[in-house]
Interface confidence: medium
């Protein structure tokens, strides 16, 4: 997987009036990294991991950049014509990637009320837009504004591409997010489900990257999908991920079941703990 930096900016309008606040979230390698709150933009590292990446410094630079981006997006929203009454949102997502062969990719995407209407490849400067007439109208509107906005358009978008990559490289230099593998902690628990049945849950946490296989096996063979329930693979705030899988089994049959985990080429098997039911709750 490539290293990536992703900016997600959102601005709002109410009855055609652009609101002063905005929200910016930054993800580094898919992990929540920085956040700029709506009213007062102050870059906030998302957890100890982000602080380690950023080092012992203030985040004035990030705050300045994110505030500037927020202002730009508010101006863009103000230029969208025919805004209807009520609440509307304009979202800009900017992504840059550095691949293992050192090649780079950068793109920018605009969403109005959650619907994608305009994308740009920041390397080729190529714009693309969906086929719907609403999206195309919005896209032309925004593109014209961005072009009018300056003679600086070329340098502006080149700078967006270069700045994103420069920031990504700077963060990667911290060493904290260099290509790494963090194995999961796996924990198996059991809980009462209904008379004669128990729910067994296998949790994996603290792993990186996010790709993981977690499944229940009976007598050494994976159960079919319809007998298992999976949780989403979610960031845990520490630069790593967590997930779970559960299944319902007959009490007394625990010894036949194991949780199978595979991550980054390593795998392990984890039995159901014997003894009393530990947690009195049901996932199903």
């Amino acid at each position: 997987e490539p290293h990536s930096l992703r900016y997600n900016l959102t601005v709002l309008s109410w009855d055609g009036s652009v609101q002063s606040g905005f929200l910016t979230e930054v993800h580094l390698d898919g992990q929540p990294f920085l956040r700029c709150d709506r009213q007062k933009c102050r870059a906030k590292p998302q957890g100890q991991w982000a602080e380690d990446v950023l080092g012992n410094k203030t985040w004035d630079r990030e705050t300045r950049d994110l505030t500037g981006n927020g202002k730009d997006l508010r101006m863009t929203l103000a230029h969208i014509k025919d805004q209807k009454e009520g609440l509307h949102s304009l979202q800009e997502i900017r992504v840059c990637e550095i691949h293992e062969d050192n090649s780079t990719r950068s793109s920018q995407h605009f969403y109005y009320d959650g619907e994608l209407f305009l994308s740009q490849n920041l390397e080729t400067k190529e714009w693309t837009m969906p086929q719907s007439s609403r999206a195309q109208t919005l896209a032309m509107n925004v593109r014209n504004f961005l072009k009018e906005d300056a003679m600086k358009t070329k340098t502006h978008y080149h700078a967006m591409h270069a700045d994103c990559l420069q920031e990504l490289r700077r963060y990667l230099k911290s060493g904290v997010v260099l290509r790494r593998t963090v194995p999961p902690m796996v924990n198996v628990t059991r809980s009462e489900a209904s008379e004669g049945n128990i729910t067994v849950t296998c949790r994996a946490s603290g792993f990186y990257p996010w790709n993981i296989t977690l499944s229940w096996r009976q007598d050494g063979v994976s159960l079919s999908h319809d007998t298992q329930q999976w949780g989403d693979v979610l960031p845990d705030g520490n630069g790593t991920y967590q997930t779970w899988v559960a299944t319902r089994i007959c009490q007394g049959e625990e010894q036949r079941f194991t949780c199978y985990m595979e991550h980054s080429g390593n795998h392990s098997t984890h039995p159901v703990p014997s003894g009393k039911v530990l947690v009195l709750q049901s996932h199903w």
Epitope: Q218, D219, G220, V221, S224, C250, E253, Q255, R256, T258, H267, S268, T269, P271
Partner: antibody, heavy 118, light 108 residues
């Protein structure tokens, strides 16, 4: 191609022990359990137990628990069945099998005939 | 322990005829855990049908399985010469894993 190759026939005296091997190939040995089943002459199939080679967990049929030991060597992808204090009624063909979906037996070894006779 | 009782013990039929083999469990089992095997003289058993009605790899379509709860059936729609063998049902739902005593399908 999945293959389970068992050791050759054995003739033992009552009270002795026998150890049958089952070498697996064609799949990742630790990813499936190995079952052991026996079949006395002219009789049906009887499940003895199984081993999960990855964690070394062994489940025995209580009927055999006192006299049977199941082991596995992951370095050679081989499972073993040892039966002690042999009696004439232990005369049977002993099969190893790989666990399949929902606790069935999807591949079988060719069988090892163990004859207990004084 | 779940006891599986197969009937009949022996079925004498001619090639081309339909064979119906029954397997009755002493207590209800999930249909996901009922399987059938074929064994010919001097050979190892071979998985025929898994999860009540799914044909194992390489098994001809003339074999089919059905059932639920405590009663399960293996059907061979039109017997071929190579189908004359002993058939076993097996349950994997609870320990110990158990087999039926077998039904021998012989040439009449």
């Amino acid at each position: 191609e999945v293959q389970l190759v068992q050791s050759g026939a054995e003739v033992k005296k009552p009270g002795a022990s026998v150890k049958v091997s089952c070498k697996a190939s064609g799949y990742a040995f630790t990813s499936n359990n190995i079952y052991w089943v026996r079949q006395a002459p002219g009789q049906g199939l009887e499940w003895i137990g199984y081993i999960d080679p990855y964690i070394g967990r062994i489940i025995y049929n209580q009927q055999f628990k006192d006299r049977v030991t199941i082991t596995a060597d992951t370095s050679t992808s081989t499972a073993y069945l040892e039966l002690s204090s042999l009696r004439s009624e232990d005369t049977a063909v002993y099969y190893c099998s790989r666990s399949g979906e929902r606790s069935n037996f999807d591949y079988w070894g060719q069988g090892t005939l163990v004859t207990v006779s004084s | 322990e779940i006891v599986l009782t197969q009937s009949p013990a022996t079925l004498s039929l001619s090639p081309g005829e339909r064979a119906t083999l029954s397997c009755s469990a002493s207590s209800s089992i999930s249909s996901n855990y009922l399987h059938w095997y074929q064994q010919k003289p001097g050979q190892s058993p071979r998985l025929l049908i898994y999860r009540t009605s799914n044909l194992a790899s390489g098994v001809p379509a003339r074999f089919s399985g059905s059932g639920s709860g405590t009663d399960y059936t293996l059907t061979i729609s039109s017997l071929e010469p190579e189908d004359f063998a002993v058939y076993y049902c097996q349950q994997g739902g609870s320990l110990p894993l158990t087999f039926g005593q077998g039904t021998k399908v012989e040439i009449k």
